[in-house]
C-alpha cells in the first residue's frame, strides 16, 4: 500500500479548495480569492462565476464550489445553470423581439414566460365549449352535445374533465 501511494501522482492528495502547485514541489496551495476547485487533484483553480447586471447571486462562490445565479425580479432563468435571464411578461402575453405582446385571439398563456398556445379544440374530442377561453386561460370543454340532448337516456351526466392532481369535491 505504501509503495502504491508513493508511486501515485502527489497531486491526487490535494483536496477540493486547493490546487497542486508545481512551483512549490507539488504542495497543495489554497485557491486564490474569487476562484474554486470542486474536485481534488486539480492543477489550477477555476474562476468563480460573477452574477452581475440582471443576474443575482443565489449562492456565493466558495473555495470548493462555484457561485450560482438567478435573475432579478421581472426576469426568469433560461438554460443550464441559469445561463441567461429572459424578461417576464404578464399572463396573456408572450415575449417577442419587440417586447411583450398580447396573445392573439384563439391563443392563451397562463404563465409569465413561454409562448401563447392555441385554445383546446373541444370538438376534436366530440365535446362542447363549457367556458370560453381568454388570453390568460384555455377553454373548458364540457360534455358532448349528444349528452345534453333532451332524449338522452343517461341517468348521470359524465363528470367534467378534471385537471391532474385535483381531487373531486
Amino acid at each position: 500500500f505504501e509503495r502504491t501511494r508513493s508511486l501515485q501522482d502527489p497531486c491526487s492528495n490535494c483536496p477540493a479548495g486547493t490546487f497542486c502547485d508545481n512551483n512549490r514541489n507539488q504542495i497543495c496551495s489554497p485557491c486564490p480569492p474569487n476562484s474554486f476547485s470542486s474536485a481534488g487533484g486539480q492543477r489550477t483553480c477555476d474562476i468563480c462565476r460573477q452574477c452581475k447586471g440582471v443576474f443575482r447571486t443565489r449562492k456565493e462562490c466558495s473555495s470548493t464550489s462555484n457561485a450560482e445565479c438567478d435573475c432579478t425580479p421581472g426576469f426568469h432563468c433560461l438554460g443550464a445553470g441559469c445561463s441567461m435571464c429572459e424578461q417576464d411578461c404578464k399572463q396573456g402575453q408572450e415575449l417577442t423581439k419587440k417586447g411583450c405582446k398580447d396573445c392573439c385571439f384563439g391563443t392563451f398563456n397562463d404563465q409569465k414566460r413561454g409562448i401563447c398556445r392555441p385554445w383546446t379544440n373541444c370538438s376534436l374530442d366530440g365535446k362542447s365549449v363549457l367556458v370560453n377561453g381568454t388570453k390568460e386561460r384555455d377553454v373548458v370543454c364540457g360534455p358532448s352535445p349528444a349528452d345534453l340532448s333532451p332524449g338522452a337516456s343517461s341517468v348521470t351526466p359524465p363528470a367534467p374533465a378534471r385537471e391532474p392532481g385535483h381531487s373531486p369535491q
Partner: nanobody, 122 residues
Framework: EVQLLESGGGLVQPGGSLRLSCAAS????????VGWVRQAPGKGLEWVSA????????YYAESVKGRFTISRDNAKNTLYLQMSSLRAEDTAVYYC???????????????RGQGTQVTVSS
C-alpha cells in the same frame, strides 16, 4: 524578471500593529490582482487579503476582517498590509502573492519573495 520583496515583519505584542510592504519589480502592480498569503508554523498557506479586478474589489479572510487593511501605492509599485489588533494566531510568515490567470481559464498564484516573519507574543 518578476520579483516580490516583502518587509516590515517583526515581533509585536498582542493588540499591537505592523505594516508590511511588498516592493514589486518586473510587472506593474496596478494592472494585476495581488495580495498576501501567510503560513503559520506547521500549517498550510492561507489567503489573508487581496486587491482584485485591478482594484475594483478587495478580499479579506474572515479571521482578519476589520483588523487588516490592504492598499497599494501605484507610483512606488508597492503593496501594503496594515495589521492592527494583532493576535497570537496571526503569527506566521507573510508572503506577497500575484494571482495568475492562465490562458486555459485556470487560476493559480505565485509568491517569489522569501516572506517576512510576523510574531505576536507577549
Amino acid at each position: 524578471e518578476v520579483q516580490l520583496l516583502e518587509s516590515g515583519g517583526g515581533l509585536v505584542q498582542p493588540g499591537g500593529s505592523l505594516r508590511l510592504s511588498c516592493a514589486a519589480s518586473g510587472f506593474t502592480l496596478s494592472a494585476e490582482d495581488v495580495g498576501w498569503v501567510r503560513q503559520a508554523p506547521g500549517k498550510g498557506l492561507e489567503w489573508v487579503s487581496a486587491i482584485l479586478d485591478h482594484g475594483g474589489s478587495t478580499y479579506y479572510a474572515e479571521s482578519v476582517k476589520g483588523r487588516f487593511t490592504i492598499s497599494r501605492d501605484n507610483a512606488k509599485n508597492t503593496l501594503y498590509l496594515q495589521m492592527s489588533s494583532l493576535r497570537a494566531e496571526d503569527t506566521a510568515v507573510y508572503y506577497c502573492a500575484r494571482v495568475i490567470y492562465h490562458a486555459g481559464g485556470g487560476v493559480t498564484f505565485d509568491t517569489r519573495g522569501q516572506g517576512t516573519q510576523v510574531t505576536v507574543s507577549s
